[in-house]
């Protein structure tokens, strides 16, 4: 595609190239043959993040505590507010418009990856030799107790939900 009639950071209006408003400012009036583009800074709690010809600035996002949200990064005239979730909660979408409680890993499953403000807990089934007997958002699968290192023997086999039960070795009479 060939370049357009107006350069970067310009726009075409009524047969002339006018300067776009810089980020953080909105358009008040287009340029004319005799005047420059007129721009005004965005107000408090407003922003525009690109070179633009918008006549209204966008409102900063509101991090609603009733939805479990809090401010991660305060907005400026050039950037929107970034929300994240309260401790123990995570965003339901990339836009982080609401939060849900972190999921817990059921018995038989351990935490593979602890949840963050933007991602849920990732669980994995406990493999042979490991168990989890609690519902938790933090606990990994624990290895079965090694009876041998305690000079004990396995009295009850472990499962993915229970540890092995160790007991004393039978004495030879």
């Amino acid at each position: 595609e060939p370049p357009t009639a107006c350069r970067e950071k310009q726009y075409l209006i009524n047969s002339q190239c006018c300067s776009l408003c810089q980020p953080g400012q909105k358009l008040v009036s287009d340029c004319t043959e005799f005047t420059e583009t007129e721009c005004l800074p965005c107000g408090e709690s407003e922003f525009l993040d690109t070179w633009n010809r918008e006549t209204h600035c966008h409102q900063h996002k509101y991090c609603d505590p009733n939805l479990g949200l809090r401010v991660q990064q305060k907005g400026t005239s050039e950037t929107d507010t970034i929300c994240t979730c309260e401790e123990g909660w995570h965003c339901t979408s990339e836009a982080c418009e609401s939060c849900v409680l972190h999921r817990s890993c059921s018995p038989g499953f351990g935490v593979k990856q602890i949840a963050t403000g933007v991602s849920d807990t990732i669980c994995e089934p406990c493999p042979v030799g490991f168990f989890s007997n609690v519902s938790s958002a933090f606990e990994k699968c624990h290895p079965w107790t090694s009876c041998e290192t305690k000079d004990l023997v396995v009295q009850q086999a472990g499962t993915n939900k229970t540890d092995v039960v160790c007991g004393p070795q039978d004495r030879l009479r």
């Epitope: 060939p2 370049p3 357009t4 009639a5 107006c6 350069r7 075409l12 209006i13 009524n14 047969s15 002339q16 190239c17 287009d30 004319t32 043959e33």
Partner: antibody, heavy 116, light 107 residues
Framework: QVQLVQSGAEVKKPGASVKVSCKAS????????IEWVRQAPGQGLEWIGV????????NYNEKFKGRVTLTADKSISTAYMELSRLRSDDTAVYFC?????????WGQGTLVTVSS | EIVMTQSPATLSVSPGERATLSCRAS??????LNWYQQKPGQAVRLLIS???RLHSGIPARFSGSGSGTEYTLTISSLQSEDFAVYFC?????????FGQGTKVEIK
């Protein structure tokens, strides 16, 4: 004073191409856009495209895309409009105009007749 | 594209009378509306740009008004040299588009 002087009338056969020139004087050629418009006999005005003579950037009416080419030669303050694959309904007066706030100054027009 | 509709198609007026020409856009054009005069054998002339700005050298009897989608060209007292065809044109959104014209003729 601002003047736009266009090349003379042309008669072309269907399928041929035509190149109309527009020589500007009386202002800084690279400071204003050049617009191209046509008017078929007894009809209204139809916008073809616009060129920035400063660096050759263009915008075309979708209707003419692929058939029209706008160019400019800064050294002689002249803009050109070339229309290819001519059809009988391209018969019209072709105008160049200097931009500003609107089409501020117009050329006298160039009659292009397409006939077999 | 934005469709420009002019009315009336022909306006018959006596010299010295007032003439009012209308132009309607199919959507809001934010005052980017220009008026042109065309006479046989002469170059097209810009009369008014951006709704109401009189172009250099144009007599003050020509004036423009309007907003949104409705615009008006007024010639307060018609002179003999004002009998011509008048076109409106929007400069808000590509492709630029023109009205079909209003012919102002002697009554």
């Amino acid at each position: 004073q601002v003047q736009l002087v266009q090349s003379g009338a042309e008669v072309k056969k269907p399928g041929a191409s035509v190149k109309v020139s527009c020589k500007a004087s009386g202002y800084g050629f690279t400071n204003y856009l050049i617009e191209w418009v046509r008017q078929a006999p007894g009809q209204g005005l139809e916008w073809i495209g616009v060129i920035n003579p400063g660096y050759g950037g263009v915008n075309y009416n979708e209707k003419f895309k692929g058939r029209v080419t706008l160019t400019a030669d800064k050294s002689i303050s002249t803009a050109y409009m070339e229309l290819s694959r001519l059809r009988s309904d391209d018969t019209a007066v072709y105008f160049c105009a200097r931009g500003g706030s609107g089409f501020a100054f117009w050329g006298q027009g160039t009659l292009v007749t397409v006939s077999s | 594209e934005i469709v420009m509709t002019q009315s009336p198609a022909t306006l018959s007026v006596s010299p010295g009378e007032r003439a009012t020409l209308s132009c309607r856009a199919s959507q809001d054009i934010s005052n980017h509306l220009n008026w042109y005069q065309q006479k046989p054998g002469q170059a097209v002339r810009l009369l008014i740009s951006s709704t109401s700005r009189l172009h250099s050298g144009i007599p003050a009897r020509f004036s423009g008004s309007g907003s949104g989608t409705e615009y008006t060209l007024t010639i307060s007292s018609l002179q003999s040299e004002d009998f011509a065809v008048y076109f409106c044109q929007q400069g808000n959104t590509l492709p630029w588009t023109f009205g079909q014209g209003t012919k102002v003729e002697i009554k």
